[in-house]
């Protein structure tokens, strides 16, 4: 959609084990109220408060890995838009289902 990008990035997904999976709360940031973003959580996709990212425009070294397969999800949510929104050396790359922070491959 032509709407502008919501600030911040999804909080890191907790490593806890899920005991009860929830149906998705949202399909994109624009289905979340206020500043909340549509994010993966331990037990599903939820509207969560974003976290700030330093220097979001910085491009990081390396290339995005090639992805294979077809996404079965309609309007997959993007969990990042730019490299600078990703922690450490991770890059923001288009995966099978939307953009996410992944380890780059050597250029």
């Amino acid at each position: 959609s032509g709407k502008s990008f919501k600030a911040g990035v999804c909080p890191p997904k907790k490593s806890a084990q899920c005991l009860r999976y929830k149906k998705p709360e949202c399909q994109s940031d624009w289905q979340c109220p206020g500043k909340k973003r549509c994010c993966p959580d331990t037990c599903g996709i939820k509207c969560l408060d974003p976290v700030d990212t330093p220097n979001p425009t910085r491009r990081k070294p390396g290339k995005c890995p090639v992805t294979y397969g077809q996404c079965l999800m309609l309007n997959p949510p993007n969990f990042c838009e730019m490299d600078g929104q990703c922690k450490r050396d991770l890059k923001c790359c288009m995966g099978m289902c939307g953009k996410s922070c992944v380890s780059p491959v050597k250029a």
Epitope: R20, P33, C47
Partner: antibody, heavy 122, light 108 residues
Framework: QVQLQESGPGLVKPSQTLSLTCTVS??????????WSWVRQLPGKGLEWIGY???????YYNPSLKSRVTISIDTSKNQFSLKLSSVTAADTAVYYC??????????????WGQGTLVTVSS | EIVMTQSPTTLSVSPGERATLSCRAG??????LAWYQQKPGQAPRLLIY???TRATGIPARFSGSGSGTEFTLTISSLQSEDFAVYYC??????????FGQGTKVEIN
């Protein structure tokens, strides 16, 4: 005993916006265990899921209707609402509000409103 | 979206007999499947969820089975109040949730 009741005009003109409200009684709409849904049934046809809303205001819509649908919630009144814009005769249907478990292990629409027939005609 | 196909379209059964209704999913939905009963002029009523769990207040003569793409609703001994239209519905992974086109169970 949870009860749901739809209200709104039964006749809408083509190109206008259909607006319906569902009032929930016998239980709080603020429970995190449920999504609040709209489902419609075209005359003599099957059922079509329109979308749902969570108490927090987050929504998920059927992609086939997404560009025309808005579902909103008013927790203070224990109500949620449907707006469907740019309606045509093809939107003539019985519209139901329903409660749906928010977890996969409680899936299905366990409580329904009685349904309201909305006719699109000039 | 996942297409749900029900068969037969109409099932003619005598009271006291057994009725078996089928529902096929276009792709696997695990056990995320519900069955509903709808009578003329009424809202649907949830019978079964999780493919085989009876909803609150549903008589034991209704049972559901299956997983993946093939599902069955069985009514062991049809009562007069069971003549209605039955719908299956999937709620797997990502919406849109979709319904089958319905099976009408009529008196033979």
């Amino acid at each position: 005993q949870v009860q749901l009741q739809e209200s709104g005009p039964g006749l809408v003109k083509p190109s206008q916006t259909l607006s319906l409200t569902c009032t929930v009684s016998g239980g709080s709409i603020k429970s995190g265990d449920y999504y609040w849904s709209w489902v419609r049934q075209l005359p003599g046809k099957g059922l079509e899921w329109i979308g749902y809303i969570y108490y927090s205001g987050s929504t998920y819509y059927n992609p086939s209707l997404k560009s025309r649908v808005t579902i909103s919630i008013d927790t203070s009144k224990n109500q949620f609402s449907l707006k469907l814009s740019s309606v045509t005769a093809a939107d003539t249907a019985v519209y139901y509000c329903a409660r749906e478990g928010s977890y996969y292990d409680s899936g299905g629409f366990d409580y329904w409103g009685q349904g309201t027939l909305v006719t699109v005609s000039s | 979206e996942i297409v749900m196909t029900q068969s037969p379209t109409t099932l003619s059964v005598s009271p006291g007999e057994r009725a078996t209704l089928s529902c096929r999913a276009g792709q696997s939905v695990g056990n995320n499947l519900a069955w509903y009963q709808q009578k003329p002029g009424q809202a649907p009523r949830l019978l079964i969820y999780g493919a085989s769990t009876r909803a609150t207040g549903i008589p034991a003569r209704f049972s559901g089975s299956g997983s993946g793409t093939e599902f069955t609703l069985t009514i062991s001994s049809l009562q007069s109040e069971d003549f209605a239209v039955y719908y299956c519905q999937q709620y797997n992974n990502w919406p849109p949730w979709t319904f089958g086109q319905g099976t009408k169970v009529e008196i033979n």
